[in-house]
């Protein structure tokens, strides 16, 4: 019998408010046995896949997606899904990336550390098999 797949979670390092030109890494997390993680923009037609998946703990796998130099076009909501053959999971909650001008003024908001969106219930949508170009400026990475 096929197992029920837990929903993934998504977080951003160093946070979700990123100065223009700085880097951000989205971290997708899921269960043991994930083969592919996908980071999606608000429209599912723009996404990036990685098969570079590591087991972070005995119960949790992860993949990392890095944007080296954030631009205004990178702002917006992101979410993760994963493929554990033969099924795709549901999506994580959205995580909103905010890009701020590097004015350096005293009222500039600090980068929010460790922002994340964990699993909460939302309707299932399993139509994840369309193929589309990877998001500009996104690349998959794995860091140790």
């Amino acid at each position: 019998q096929e197992e029920d797949l837990p929903r993934p979670s998504i977080s951003a390092e160093p946070g979700t408010v990123i100065p223009l030109g700085s880097h951000v890494t989205f971290v997708c997390r899921g269960p043991v046995g994930v083969q592919t993680f996908r980071l999606e923009r608000e429209s599912r037609s723009t996404y990036n896949d990685t098969e570079d998946v590591s087991q972070a703990s005995p119960s949790e796998s992860e993949a990392r997606f890095r944007i080296d130099s954030v631009s205004e076009g990178n702002a917006g909501p992101y979410r993760c899904i994963y493929y554990k053959p033969p099924k795709w999971s549901e999506q994580s909650d959205y995580l909103e990336l905010l890009v701020k001008e590097t004015s350096g003024g005293p009222d500039s908001p600090d980068t929010e550390p460790g922002s994340s969106a964990g699993p909460t219930q939302r309707p299932s949508d399993n139509s994840h098999n369309e193929h589309a170009p990877a998001s500009q400026g996104l690349k998959a990475e794995h860091l140790y």
Partner: antibody, heavy 116, light 110 residues
């Protein structure tokens, strides 16, 4: 019942390229990453390489250039490009179970003997 | 290049005893570790995945532990059927490095 099976092992002379084939039953092989592992007589397991579902490959450093892994929609192949006597071994194909799980569904192996 | 060093190379223990096998990685591999049992003429059989998870059908006498670079397989209440070779595997085959197998430990039951 899910299973994998290797074929193509035989006696060949040194320098003669040899291709081994892995087939699957009970699951769709193209959905999975697949590993090749070998074991020389009386020795331990040696990981050769892996082909991902996307067709990208990863090899052990010692295996780079000596082996080529490829796949079709129904099979995964291991080519020994220029065999030497040190390549005499049982060659195993295994399905990669995903992160943390590794190569967990193994075939029975196929014996390759390199001798003049 | 990642190296997995398994110790001891061989061990002999009586029925009912306990065997501890260590696997040391040359760099941190987080929880990307599995353990296998292999008997002569057979392919390896997975015992443990992701450091400490028991594979389907494997008795709870087999226990995996560790993290980072140091990992352990403990077999308690040894039975004659446990006589075999045991291997650790780093299960990460990504962009940072590729895994592989330890050198193996032969377990003899007295």
């Amino acid at each position: 019942e899910q299973s994998v099976e290797e074929s193509g092992g035989r006696l060949v002379t040194p320098g003669t390229p040899l291709t081994l084939t892995c087939t699957a039953s009970g699951f769709t092989i193209s959905d999975y990453h697949m590993c090749w592992v070998r074991q020389a007589p009386g020795k331990g397991l040696e990981w050769i390489g892996l082909i991902r579902a996307s067709h990208s490959t990863a090899y052990a450093s010692w295996a780079n250039g000596r082996f080529t892994i490829s796949r079709t929609s129904t099979t995964v192949d291991l080519k020994i490009t220029s065999p030497t006597s040190e390549d005499t071994a049982t060659y195993f194909c295994a399905r990669y179970g995903g992160s943390g799980i590794g190569c967990n569904l193994w075939g029975p192996g196929t014996l390759v003997t390199i001798s003049s | 290049e990642l190296v997995l060093t398994q110790t001891p190379a061989s061990v002999s223990e009586p029925v009912g005893g306990t065997v501890t096998i260590k696997c040391q990685a040359s760099q941190s591999i987080d929880s990307n570790l599995a353990w296998y049992q292999q008997k002569p003429g057979q392919p390896p059989k997975q015992l443990i995945y992701a450091v400490s998870n028991l594979a389907s059908g494997v008795p709870s006498r087999f226990k995996g532990s560790g993290s980072g670079t140091e990992f352990t397989l403990t077999i308690s209440d040894l039975e004659c059927a446990d006589a075999a070779s045991y291997y650790c595997e780093c299960t990460y085959y990504g962009n940072s490095y590729v895994g592989g197998f330890g050198g193996g430990t032969e377990v003899e039951i007295k």
